[in-house]
C-alpha cells in the first residue's frame, strides 16, 4: 500500500510541478519594474523569456516578442534552453510514469518492467526539476547583477534639473512559480525513485523463499510468490493477486516522475 501511495503521490506532485514549469516558462513576469524610486509610475514594465510588456496606468497593455535569436543575451538563451529541456524531460517522464503506475495494468507487464519505468520517470523528473531550478536561478542571478549595476548608475544624465532615471528590474512572479514548480518536480522524482525500490523484486528475498519452499511447500509456493510480486502470468496467479492475497503496496508501488505536461 505504501509503495502504491508513494508512486501515486510522486506522480501527482510531479504532474503539478511540470504544470508549474510550463506555466512559469510561458509567463511574462520573469522580471518586473522595480518601483522603489517611483511607486506612482503611470507606466509599468515587465519581461518574460519570450516577450516584454508595458502596462499603462490607463489599462492598456502592449507586449512585444523578441523577434531575434542572435540579438538576445546568451544567458537568456541558456535559461530558455534549460526550461524547455525541463519541460520536454518532464513530459516524457509523465508519459513513462503513467504506464509505470501500479494501479494501471497494461497487458501482462511485469513488475520489473514497471519498476524500471518508474525509476526512469523518477530520474527524468529529478533532472527536469533541476533544469527548471537552474534556469530560474540563472535568470535571478542575472537580475541581481543588473539591478546593482543600474543602481550604481541610477542617474545616467544629470544636466541641471534634468534627470534620466534608469529602469531597474526585480524578481517577477514567474521566478517564484518556477522555483516552487522545479522543487515539486524534484520531490516527485525522488518519490518515484523511492517507490521503484518497493516495486523491484529483490533477488535475496526470492532465494530465501525458494529455500524455505522445500520445508513449507504449501505456504511458500513459488507461484504464489510470483503472484504477489506480479511475475506470474497464469490465471491462477492473477486470481490470487486480484483477490487481494497481498496488498497492492506490497506488490508494487512506484512514484512516477512525469506529473505535468
Amino acid at each position: 500500500m505504501a509503495v502504491t501511495a508513494c508512486q501515486g503521490l510522486g506522480f501527482v506532485v510531479s504532474l503539478i510541478g511540470i504544470a508549474g514549469i510550463i506555466a512559469a516558462t510561458c509567463m511574462d513576469q520573469w522580471s518586473t519594474q522595480d518601483l522603489y524610486n517611483n511607486p506612482v509610475t503611470a507606466v509599468f514594465n515587465y519581461q518574460g523569456l519570450w516577450r516584454s510588456c508595458v502596462r499603462e496606468s490607463s489599462g492598456f497593455t502592449e507586449c512585444r516578442g523578441y523577434f531575434t535569436l542572435l540579438g538576445l543575451p546568451a544567458m537568456l538563451q541558456a535559461v530558455r534552453a534549460l526550461m524547455i529541456v525541463g519541460i520536454v524531460l518532464g513530459a516524457i517522464g509523465l508519459l513513462v510514469s503513467i504506464f509505470a503506475l501500479k494501479c494501471i495494468r497494461i497487458g501482462s507487464m511485469e513488475d520489473s518492467a514497471k519498476a524500471n519505468m518508474t525509476l526512469t520517470s523518477g530520474i527524468m523528473f529529478i533532472v527536469s526539476g533541476l533544469c527548471a531550478i537552474a534556469g530560474v536561478s540563472v535568470f535571478a542571478n542575472m537580475l541581481v547583477t543588473n539591478f546593482w549595476m543600474s543602481t550604481a548608475n541610477m542617474y545616467t544624465g544629470m544636466g541641471g534639473m534634468v534627470q534620466t532615471v534608469q529602469t531597474r528590474y526585480t524578481f517577477g512572479a514567474a521566478l517564484f512559480v518556477g522555483w516552487v514548480a522545479g522543487g515539486l518536480t524534484l520531490i516527485g522524482g525522488v518519490m518515484m525513485c523511492i517507490a521503484c525500490r518497493g516495486l523491484a523484486p529483490e533477488e535475496t528475498n526470492y532465494k530465501a523463499v525458494s529455500y524455505h519452499a522445500s520445508g513449507h511447500s504449501v505456504a511458500y509456493k513459488p507461484g504464489g510468490f510470483k503472484a504477489s510480486t506480479g511475475f506470474g502470468s497464469n490465471t491462477k496467479n492473477k486470481k490470487i493477486y486480484d483477490g487481494g492475497a497481498r496488498t497492492e503496496d506490497e506488490v508494487q508501488s512506484y512514484p512516477s516522475k512525469h506529473d505535468y505536461v
Partner: antibody, heavy 118, light 113 residues
Framework: EVQLVESGGGSVKPGGSRKLSCAAS????????MHWVRQAPEKGLEWVAY????????YYTDTVKGRFTISRDNAKNTLFLQMTGLRSEDTAMYYC???????????WGQGTSVTVSS | DIVMTQSPSSLTVTAGEKVTMSCKSS????????????LTWYQQKPGQPPKLLLY???TRESGVPDRFTGSGSGTDFTLTISSVQAEDLTVYYC?????????FGAGTKLELK
C-alpha cells in the same frame, strides 16, 4: 458618441463641501480609468485625481490629498469627486476626462465651475 | 514631481507659416520597456475643454490634421504646426504621462500677428 457631462458645481464657502458628478455615455465606462482635471480662471490645467476602471487604484495631486475623494459607480456610468475642506485656491472649472492609450486623456466633459468664496 | 516647462509662453504668428513650440521635462519621459516617450499634447480653445492632439510624443490622435507633428525624446519635445490656420490660434499644453502626478506645462499661446 462618447459624452461626459459634469454637474454639481456652484458657489461654496471656505471649509465647505461639494460633490461633483460626471455622467458618461457612448462607451463602456467600466473599461476605462477616469480623471478629474481643473483649471483656475485664466490659468493653466492642473491634474487633480485618477481612479482606475475597477476602483482599485487612486492617485491625487498633493494639494487635494486628504480633502478630495474620487469614486465611481460603474453600474450607473458615473464618476464622482467628493470635495471637503474647500479653499479659495480650489476655485476652478473641473473637468472629468477619459484615460486611454498612451496615458492620454482623449475625451473631456464641458466642465463644471466651482467657486469658493466667503 | 516632474516639472514641465513650455516655451515660449506666447507666440505671434501669421497664417500659413510654420510654428514650433518647445516642452521640456525635468525627468526623462522615455520608457525603456517600449522605447516610447510618455508626453501628450493638448489644444484648448477659449471656453472649451482641452482636445487631445498627440500622445507618445508623436502619435496623432484620430481626426487631428497632419499639419500637427510632434518630435523629441527623453526630456526635450517639440510641437510643430507646418502651416498655421486661423483655427489653430489658441493655447497648447504638454503633459507628462509617465508618472503621477500627471503634470501639465503652463501652456503656449498662439496669437495672430
Amino acid at each position: 458618441e462618447v459624452q461626459l457631462v459634469e454637474s454639481g458645481g456652484g458657489s461654496v464657502k471656505p471649509g465647505g463641501s461639494r460633490k461633483l458628478s460626471c455622467a458618461a455615455s457612448g462607451f463602456t465606462f467600466s473599461d476605462y480609468g477616469m480623471h478629474w482635471v481643473r483649471q483656475a480662471p485664466e490659468k493653466g490645467l492642473e491634474w487633480v485625481a485618477y481612479i482606475s476602471s475597477g476602483s482599485n487604484t487612486f492617485y491625487y495631486t498633493d494639494t487635494v490629498k486628504g480633502r478630495f475623494t474620487i469614486s465611481r459607480d460603474n453600474a450607473k456610468n458615473t464618476l464622482f469627486l467628493q470635495m471637503t475642506g474647500l479653499r479659495s485656491e480650489d476655485t476652478a472649472m473641473y473637468y472629468c476626462a477619459r484615460f486611454t492609450r498612451g496615458n492620454a486623456l482623449d475625451y473631456w466633459g464641458q466642465g463644471t465651475s466651482v467657486t469658493v468664496s466667503s | 514631481d516632474i516639472v514641465m516647462t513650455q516655451s515660449p509662453s506666447s507666440l505671434t504668428v501669421t497664417a500659413g507659416e510654420k510654428v514650433t513650440m518647445s516642452c521640456k521635462s525635468s525627468q526623462s519621459l522615455l520608457n525603456s520597456g517600449n522605447q516610447k516617450n510618455y508626453l501628450t499634447w493638448y489644444q484648448q480653445k477659449p471656453g472649451q475643454p482641452p482636445k487631445l492632439l498627440l500622445y507618445w510624443a508623436s502619435t496623432r490622435e484620430s481626426g487631428v490634421p497632419d499639419r500637427f507633428t510632434g518630435s523629441g525624446s527623453g526630456t526635450d519635445f517639440t510641437l510643430t504646426i507646418s502651416s498655421v490656420q486661423a483655427e489653430d490660434l489658441t493655447v497648447y499644453y504638454c503633459q507628462n504621462a509617465y508618472s503621477y502626478p500627471l503634470t501639465f506645462g503652463a501652456g503656449t499661446k498662439l496669437e495672430l500677428k
